[in-house]
């Protein structure tokens, strides 16, 4: 059920998952000079049921220079969930941003975590694309990608998004202006044929990434 590859990369765009499906794993990685505490968790796991999901385990990092592994303890995932829920009801938080059923929110930062978070997505996970600052979107379809299982293999759908510099005015034939992504999917859910279009961009991630979930690192 784990997705084999990373979501596709689009030039001048960035993607994020706004919520993570149950079964998603997040490696507990620490930044240079720090390491996981002794007997600390290797990963966090999104678990739960249709009404309540949360991250099992917690990530904790300690200085590599110290032999003593005592560290300010981070809250258990349940405490983290409760704290975040409370904040959601505070005046500075929107009330309509509740978690999707069967999904976990982005875990709050932990001390001295690695710069990149390494997630292991499951089938059905969706990621959302946006053009980075200084670029605007030209697209014909959803600016999102979904991990799907097709004939026993996983693949990510191709987001129909092109990001162009703000000063450029070129548009697709027949397209008046960039619009919000329509609900419809640009490809069949059942077809096994995956065609490469002009919009398909090769991923820029290294193809020789380690397969172990604990050693995979993004560049």
């Amino acid at each position: 059920e784990l997705c084999d590859d990373d979501p596709p990369e689009i030039p001048h765009a960035t993607f994020k998952a706004m919520a993570y499906k149950e079964g998603t794993m997040l490696n507990c990685e620490c930044k240079r000079g720090f390491r996981r505490i002794k007997s600390g968790s290797l990963y966090m796991l999104c678990t739960g049921n249709s009404s309540h999901s949360s991250w099992d385990n917690q990530c904790q990092c300690t200085s590599s220079a110290t032999r003593n592994t005592t560290k300010q303890v981070t809250p258990q995932p349940e405490e983290q969930k409760e704290r975040k829920t409370t904040e959601m009801q505070s005046p500075m938080q929107p009330v309509d941003q509740a978690s999707l059923p069967g999904h976990c929110r982005e875990p709050p930062p932990w001390e001295n975590e690695a710069t990149e978070r390494i997630y292991h997505f499951v089938v059905g996970q969706m990621v959302y694309y946006q053009c980075v600052q200084g670029y605007r979107a030209l697209h014909r379809g959803p600016a999102e990608s979904v991990c799907k299982m097709t004939h026993g293999k996983t693949r990510w759908t191709q987001p129909q998004l092109i990001c162009t510099g703000e000063m450029e005015t070129s548009q697709f034939p027949g397209e008046e202006k960039p619009q919000a992504s329509p609900e419809g999917r640009p490809e069949s859910e059942t077809s096994c044929l995956v065609t490469t279009t002009d919009f398909q961009i090769q991923t820029e991630m290294a193809a020789t990434m380690e397969t172990s979930i604990f050693t995979t690192e993004y560049q």
């Epitope: 960035t14 938080q93 930062p109 001295n112 946006q130 600052q133």
Partner: nanobody, 130 residues
Framework: QVQLVESGGGLVQAGGSLRLSCTAS????????IGWFRQAPGKEREGVSY????????YYIDSVKGRFTISSDFAKSTVYLQMNNLKPEDTAVYYC???????????????????????WGKGTLVTVSS
Amino acid sequence: QVQLVESGGGLVQAGGSLRLSCTASGLTFEGYAIGWFRQAPGKEREGVSYITGSDASTYYIDSVKGRFTISSDFAKSTVYLQMNNLKPEDTAVYYCAVDRLGSRGGYASSWWRSGDMDLWGKGTLVTVSS
């Protein structure tokens, strides 16, 4: 547990200046957008400014452009908001917030404007009198 601690708020006359600080000890700044929201009494919260830890890209809401400047000192785990030429309409509680960057260290201002942040501070009150 990373916590966000704001300081620097206070009472100032219109046209005056304040510098807000947000300290986030232990935060890996390179993986986050860090910045400020504000909420005035009876008004909706709005994203004022952020700076990305990956490439120091900055964003400002239109109403503060040219008056506010965001900067960072990662060595001190602190982000600053220098607020000049303050106006009575800048009166609000200012909250520090962080949001995880997207793939390849990218970030989109629409994510900040959505207000769906990963972590919030408790806020510091800024009052601008006329």
